[in-house]
Amino acid sequence: LRLLDHRALVCSQPGLNCTVKNSTCLDDSWIHPRNLTPSSPKDLQIQLHFAHTQQGDLFPVAHIEWTLQTDASILYLEGAELSVLQLNTNERLCVRFEFLSKLRHHHRRWRFTFSHFVVDPDQEYEVTVHHLPKPIPDGDPNHQSKNFLVPDCEHARMKVTTPCMSSGSLWDPNITVETLEAHQLRVSFTLWNESTHYQILLTSFPHMENHSCFEHMHHIPAPRPEEFHQRSNVTLTLRNLKGCCRHQVQIQPFFSSCLNDCLRHSATVSCPEMPDTPEPIPDYMPLW
């Protein structure tokens, strides 16, 4: 978790002098509770926006927006703490809006925005806006939270962001898999425009089951420049196991920008259709 272009952060608007500060996510009002505290934010909204860095890189950012309730507690509102918690790592990043002037009621509802939290593809975040000072231990909560899931690199708009392109999102291998005679699979895919090796990972499963009955790894050496964007064809030999008929083929590239953490593409071959007619029951039952 990080902020995009930290030096450009502003929160001032007409009628309010405000500054954005780094926060430890532990506001002083937790330790020294105040008697009078503001009400909670109203109508917290989160959207995915895209922002360029000064270097020209494009990153997904969380655009956070909220409004104030129209009650007298804005007289005691000293600012807001914005917190983004990445749910799978428990990493948290906070910033603080510090109001340098008192808020006054005016003809339209106060609205605040912040669009500088960089988010990662396919990650879920808990976004919280806490009004400051925070409430006394038994006081009514004065925060609003939402869980926000960022699209993965398969998403058309995410595909062209720097983190996705770095992990190989622009490569479309267009995998085809066909079953051949004599327990073989023919795998075909389009090579990318980089002289890097690939790995084909084959995992086979019984029909309707999820524990594998066969695994195989096949190494494909780095192509020469004249082979870029060409189809690579590989024939894999399967284990002759009855019922081990559903095959998942995964292609792992090793591009220089993502090494062994590149996006993988996969294709699945289903088991052949079973005939609907029931097996004939024999006229006699053997006794042994």
């Epitope: 926000f148 699209p151 058309a156």
Partner: nanobody, 126 residues
Framework: EVQLVESGGGLVQPGRSLRLSCAAS????????MHWVRQAPGKGLEWVSG????????DYADSVKGRFTISRDNAKNSLYLQMNSLRVEDTALYYC???????????????????RGQGTLVTVSS
């Protein structure tokens, strides 16, 4: 112009099933998360269920969990709600709604819904 057209509502007895459909047009359907919301007679809007752009995430209101299933077909620009074990309290006008921005929020959308259809009426009565 964004258009969302719901269908599939009707009068049904408690315990029976219905399948609602929503045909979407005027925007890139598979870019956006979608939701179902409902409005019971004389009540406000209630979020029912949501699904992410690629069907990777689905969430449900506690009142419908285990009974309703949300799904989508991006190739057909369509959203669905399979409603089983219907109850009298499920009676409402059901709306299909588009998430305003990209991304997905469980439990009611990331921001105010910018578009919804005209709704389809579900009446559960014996």
């Amino acid at each position: 112009e964004v258009q969302l057209v719901e269908s599939g509502g009707g009068l049904v007895q408690p315990g029976r099933s219905l399948r609602l459909s929503c045909a979407a047009s005027g925007f890139t359907f598979d870019d956006y998360a979608m939701h179902w919301v409902r409005q019971a007679p004389g009540k406000g809007l209630e979020w029912v269920s949501g699904i992410s752009w690629n069907s990777g995430r689905r969430d449900y209101a506690d009142s419908v969990k285990g009974r309703f299933t949300i799904s989508r077909d991006n190739a057909k620009n369509s959203l669905y709600l399979q409603m089983n074990s219907l109850r009298v309290e499920d009676t409402a006008l059901y709306y299909c709604v588009k998430e305003t921005g990209l991304g997905y929020c469980s439990g009611g959308g990331c921001s105010d819904f910018d578009y919804r259809g005209q709704g389809t009426l579900v009446t559960v009565s014996s």
